[in-house]
């Protein structure tokens, strides 16, 4: 039921996460974990925020996006084989069993021989910043919403084909906003 | 040392209110997501409530959030449950226990407990 | 909601014995399980953790193991302060329900 992401051995890896703060500045805790998401906070965490900055992370593990705007997609740096897994993001909004909690999945292949000395474009950059989710309990498939510029037959099969990172660059080259949930 | 102490409980009319609390010693309470958990004599446990570190965040069981509200006072280092509405199905012992998840952890589970408090509804 | 069953309900065994109990859930709680030990009259104690890390104390006889929705508690050579009820509980959603319990009786 997890969404799927992948990356190749080396390169950097991008678990999209996003929330909308309630204000500019407004931030909610959120924590990213090793493993799917338990019924409180992350396990395994390896990056954790609080309502000013990141307050706790791990090497390799960082968030390239601006935070304070609610962008909290982890990067894992020069990714290896061990990185694969479920990973979950934790938007711990207060009040009453009101956390979102996201498991995504992370596949990583053996890094593709390329004889041409051609630059790859970093996974990270591949993927579209415009990516917004909404909450699901962790045995929940996560479903696509609202697409612009997209057409319906589209919609089915976009999960996967988000692993693809041609597509991803251009939905982002499209100005696609993408909604999941 | 862990100490968890609940306060007393007592006899309490049906479509009463009530509230219990539980003192914490021996550890730093704002660490701790905590926990109430209740017992009806001779029967098995049942999770209530639970609250994180900061009283910000709550859970509950759903037949009870309408009527029970957990919180705490990290500066008197105490957790409360406040019941109202109570039925005589709310008869229990209930206990405060801690949870042992740590921060950058990932570690689940009660590691300690109160020594319970007793709560009989009843006209 | 995620349903622990629990089995056996009772159990009696001697002491020196090795007893085992389980736990299924009725769905994927991903290792977020715990095991406690309760005696009569008093509260509840923390034996196991993430379904396997014993908790501080706890006597290495003592074991747990399982994934998934398939979770035991192990206890060897059991000694007398062993005998009480034993409760699993998850720790993967809301409710954190427990199992109904395994009492654990001297034969």
């Known amino acids: 039921s997890e969404v799927e992401y992948r990356a190749e051995v080396g390169q950097n890896a991008y678990l999209p996460c996003f929330y909308t703060p309630a204000a500019p500045g407004n931030l909610v805790p959120v924590c990213w974990g090793k493993g799917a998401c338990p019924v409180f906070e992350c396990g395994n965490v390896v990056l954790r925020t609080d309502e000013r900055d990141v307050n706790y992370w791990t090497s390799r593990y960082w968030l390239n996006g601006d935070f304070r705007k609610g962008d909290v997609s982890l990067t894992i740096e020069n990714v290896t084989l061990a990185d694969s897994g479920i990973y979950c993001c934790r938007i711990q909004i207060p009040g009453i069993m009101n956390d979102e909690k996201f498991n995504l999945k992370l596949v990583i292949k053996p890094a593709k021989v390329t004889p041409a000395p051609t630059r790859q474009r970093d996974f990270t950059a591949a993927f579209p910043r415009m990516l917004t989710t909404r909450g699901h309990g962790p045995a929940e498939t996560q479903t696509l919403g609202s697409l612009p510029d997209i057409n319906l037959t589209q919609i089915s099969t976009l999960a996967n084909e988000l692993r693809d990172s041609r597509l991803a660059n251009d939905l982002r080259d499209s100005g696609a906003t993408i909604r999941i949930g | 040392e862990v100490k968890l102490v609940e306060s007393e409980g007592g006899l309490v009319q049906p479509g009463s209110s009530m509230k219990i609390s539980c003192t914490a010693s021996?550890?730093?309470?704002?660490?701790?997501?905590m926990a109430w958990v209740r017992q009806v004599p001779e029967k098995g446990l049942e999770w209530v409530a639970n609250?994180?570190?900061?009283?910000?965040?709550?859970y509950y069981l759903d037949s009870l959030k309408s009527r029970f509200i957990i919180s705490r006072d990290n500066a008197k280092n105490i957790l409360y449950l406040q019941m109202s509405s109570l039925k005589s199905e709310d008869t229990a012992t209930y206990y405060c226990?801690?949870?042992?998840?740590?921060?950058?952890?990932?570690?689940?589970?009660?590691?300690?407990w109160g020594q319970g408090t007793s709560v009989t509804v009843s006209s | 909601d995620i349903q622990m069953t629990q089995s056996p309900a009772s159990l009696s065994a001697s002491v020196g014995e090795t007893v085992t109990i389980t736990c299924r859930a009725s769905?994927?709680?991903?290792?977020?399980l715990a095991w406690y030990q309760q005696k009569q009259g008093k509260s509840p104690q923390l034996l196991v953790y993430?379904?396997?890390t014993l908790a501080d104390g706890v006597p290495s006889r003592f074991s747990g193991s399982g994934s998934g929705t398939q979770y035991s508690l192990k206890i060897n050579s059991l000694q007398p302060e062993d005998f009480g009820t034993y409760y699993c509980?998850?720790?993967?959603?809301?409710?954190?329900?427990f199992g109904a319990g395994t009492k654990l009786e001297l034969k």
């Open positions: 226990a801690r949870n042992i998840y740590y921060y950058g952890g990932s570690s689940y589970g009660m590691d300690y």
């Open positions: 021996g550890f730093t309470f704002s660490d701790y997501y």
């Open positions: 609250i994180n570190y900061d009283g910000s965040r709550t």
């Open positions: 769905g994927n709680i991903h290792n977020y």
């Open positions: 993430n379904a396997e």
């Open positions: 509980q998850h720790f993967w959603s809301t409710p954190l329900t």
